[in-house]
Interface confidence: low
């Protein structure tokens, strides 16, 4: 067999090629360490595979922060997360890295972030209205379009990594520990993302994936929200995960995908995949979720959950889908468009960031170069808008 057919991202393909090496060469990045003594841990918020997370106080200004103490992993991985957070700092709905410190005794590195008063997603998602789902999905897309425009794939999009302060309608995309710089033609590790949100490309071991992986994960989130089924694809392991997907999207399109990219399927799938027809999305609608489902929601979902990563909507394309027309119109009317430095969407509460009625960022950061939807920089910063300038 001649090996898999190469694939390149449809958008933002060469953004890292057009940036100086120090932008993406995280291994050479020199970390500037802050003072751990500035922070006092208050309580543990949670723990993950790679870190423990605490609420803390910055004693120099009495502000609440979140401190992520990293477990011992390769220095390279830590540097990657730091460099990505620094590159994305100020982007719309991107969690803001405030400081990087080391525990003076253990010498363990810790990342200090802005504080978000998060509502547990399992509780929150059960209370969201149709408009809320559209609103928050649009906010996630602002973050994704921005990071993609900056040449970065998140690779772990899932509800746990989306912090929502529902009272202030503020959303942040967090946990950039698995994120990676996109270089066309590069083969990446498929052991990324959480099982229920892994794209088919990961499950069939296709390594030349790109930003579109995040769009699959987003599609899984959307499906779970509008159908009130969490998770939507509930596999027991990575193999079963593909089976669950195939039971919805069908095996015919799966084999078309495999053929298109000349992918060699793991023999373990032979006995478990079977043959399944493609299901209509309407089949998942019932009395408890029908108020969240609309023709445009199903059309949007259908354009995200595609086997072929090149066929999925890009984040920018997604933002222009009719599913978001009401949100875009409201943000334009109320004056919002998430802006760069932390930017929260305008809604009821605070207008933390923004340019106001333009659903496309650009804050005079450069006052010269604010990308249109991408997000952010004001007055003068050449960050491409979405499909834009630097491709």
């Amino acid at each position: 067999m001649s090996g898999p057919v190469p694939s390149r991202a449809r958008v933002y393909t060469d953004v890292n090629t057009h940036r100086p090496r120090e932008y993406w060469d995280y291994e050479s990045h020199v970390v500037e360490w802050g003072n751990q003594d500035d922070y006092q841990l208050v309580r543990k918020l949670g723990r993950g595979k790679y870190s423990e997370v605490f609420e803390a106080i910055n004693i120099t200004n009495n502000e609440k922060v979140v401190v992520k103490i990293l477990k011992p992993v390769k220095k390279k991985k830590i540097k990657r997360e730091i460099k990505i957070l620094e590159n994305l700092r100020g982007g719309p709905n991107i969690i803001t890295l405030a400081d990087i410190v080391k525990d003076p005794v253990s010498r363990t590195p810790a990342l200090v972030f802005e504080h978000v008063n998060n509502t547990d997603f399992k509780q929150l998602y059960q209370t969201l209205t149709d408009y809320d789902i559209r609103f928050y999905m649009y906010e996630i897309l602002k973050a994704l379009d921005y990071c993609h425009s900056m040449g970065i794939m998140h690779r772990d999009v899932k509800p746990h990594n989306v912090m929502i302060d529902h009272e202030h309608r503020k959303l942040r995309l967090i946990d950039w520990g698995l994120a990676e710089f996109y270089h066309p033609g590069q083969e990446y590790n498929v052991r990324v993302a959480s099982r229920y949100f892994k794209g088919p490309e990961l499950l069939v071991d296709y390594q030349m994936y790109d930003y579109s992986l995040d769009m699959w994960s987003l599609g899984c989130m959307l499906a779970s929200m509008i159908f009130r089924k969490e998770p939507f694809f509930h596999g027991h392991d990575n193999y079963d995960q593909l089976v669950r997907i195939a039971k919805v999207l069908g095996t015919e399109d799966l084999y078309d995908y495999i053929d298109k990219y000349n992918i060699e399927l793991d023999p373990r799938f032979n006995d478990i995949l079977g043959r399944h027809s493609r299901k209509r999305w309407e089949r998942f609608v019932h009395s408890e979720n029908q108020h969240l489902v609309s023709p445009e929601a199903l059309d949007f979902l259908d354009k995200l959950l595609r086997y072929d990563h090149q066929s999925r909507l890009t984040a920018r394309e997604a933002m222009e889908h009719p599913y978001f027309y009401t949100v875009v119109k409201d943000q334009a009317r109320m004056g919002s468009s998430s802006m760069p430095g932390g930017s929260t969407p305008v809604s009821s509460a605070n207008m933390m960031s923004g340019i106001s009625s333009v659903p496309t960022p650009s804050p005079l950061g450069p006052l010269a170069g604010s990308p249109v939807i991408a997000a952010a920089n004001p007055l003068g910063m050449p960050v491409p808008a979405a499909a834009g300038a630097q491709q």
């Epitope: 932390g342 960031s353 496309t360 006052l367 170069g369 808008a385």
Partner: antibody, heavy 111, light 107 residues
Framework: QVQLQQSGAELVRPGASVTLSCKAS????????MHWVKQTPVHGLEWIGV????????AYNQKFRGKAILTADKSSSTAYMELRSLTSEDSAVYYC????WGTGTTVTVSS | DIQMTQSPSSLSASLGERVSLTCRAS??????LNWLQQEPDGTIKRLIY???SLDSGVPKRFSGSRSGSDYSLTISSLESEDFVDYYC?????????FGGGTKLEIK
């Protein structure tokens, strides 16, 4: 090379209107928002508002709402700002800024 | 609106000297601050975005930093072309606002 070429200086009468133009070249016009900024010796730099050339969406500083109207013509990659009901307070240099800063247009309001 | 208080309003310094200009924000703006340079002919360009990131083509002698609500632009060793006007801009909260400017003059 990336450029924002602004229209020439304007001398206008009080009460009149004037339209300033800003022609973009060297980048994709619809990919970057276009901001407008006013500069005077008294008030320094003031942000007027922003236009998304792709959608026509606008946002204004409350102070300039009704004073400035932002529009764009995608076919010619040109952004426009119309200033209405001019008074001496509107005498200033006006900059457009998208991918870079424009060259600036001086507006003088005088009878 | 957020007030950006820039100091000093003018500064005399010598070639090769290290200088710092400061902007203080009246509200929290995170890292959403840029530094702009204006030539005598009115030409404006951005030097620093997001508090500390250097725009491409800007000499390394320029740097940006933050301490609480104070944001600084530092020029490590002044060159003749640096004696112009500088402004900060916050873009965290609508409407965007600028500092009053600093005129850097040669001593």
């Amino acid at each position: 090379q990336v450029q924002l070429q602004q229209s020439g200086a304007e001398l206008v009468r009080p009460g009149a209107s004037v339209t300033l133009s800003c022609k973009a070249s060297g980048y994709k016009f619809t990919d970057y928002q276009m901001h407008w900024v006013k500069q005077t010796p008294v008030h320094g730099l003031e942000w007027i508002g922003v236009l998304d050339p792709g959608t026509g969406g606008t946002a204004y500083n409350q102070k300039f709402r009704g004073k400035a109207i932002l529009t764009a013509d995608k076919s010619s990659s040109t952004a426009y700002m119309e200033l209405r009901s001019l008074t001496s307070e509107d005498s200033a240099v006006y900059y457009c800024t998208g991918f870079v800063w424009g060259t600036g247009t001086t507006v003088t309001v005088s009878s | 609106d957020i007030q950006m208080t820039q100091s000093p309003s003018s500064l005399s310094a010598s070639l090769g000297e290290r200088v710092s200009l400061t902007c203080r924000a009246s509200q929290d703006i995170g890292s959403s601050l840029n530094w702009l340079q204006q030539e005598p002919d009115g030409t404006i360009k951005r030097l620093i975005y997001a508090t500390s990131s250097l725009d491409s083509g800007v000499p390394k002698r320029f740097s940006g930093s933050r301490s609480g609500s104070d944001y600084s632009l530092t020029i490590s060793s002044l060159e003749s072309e640096d004696f112009v006007d500088y402004y900060c801009l916050q873009y965290a909260i609508f409407p965007y606002t600028f500092g009053g400017g600093t005129k850097l003059e040669i001593k």
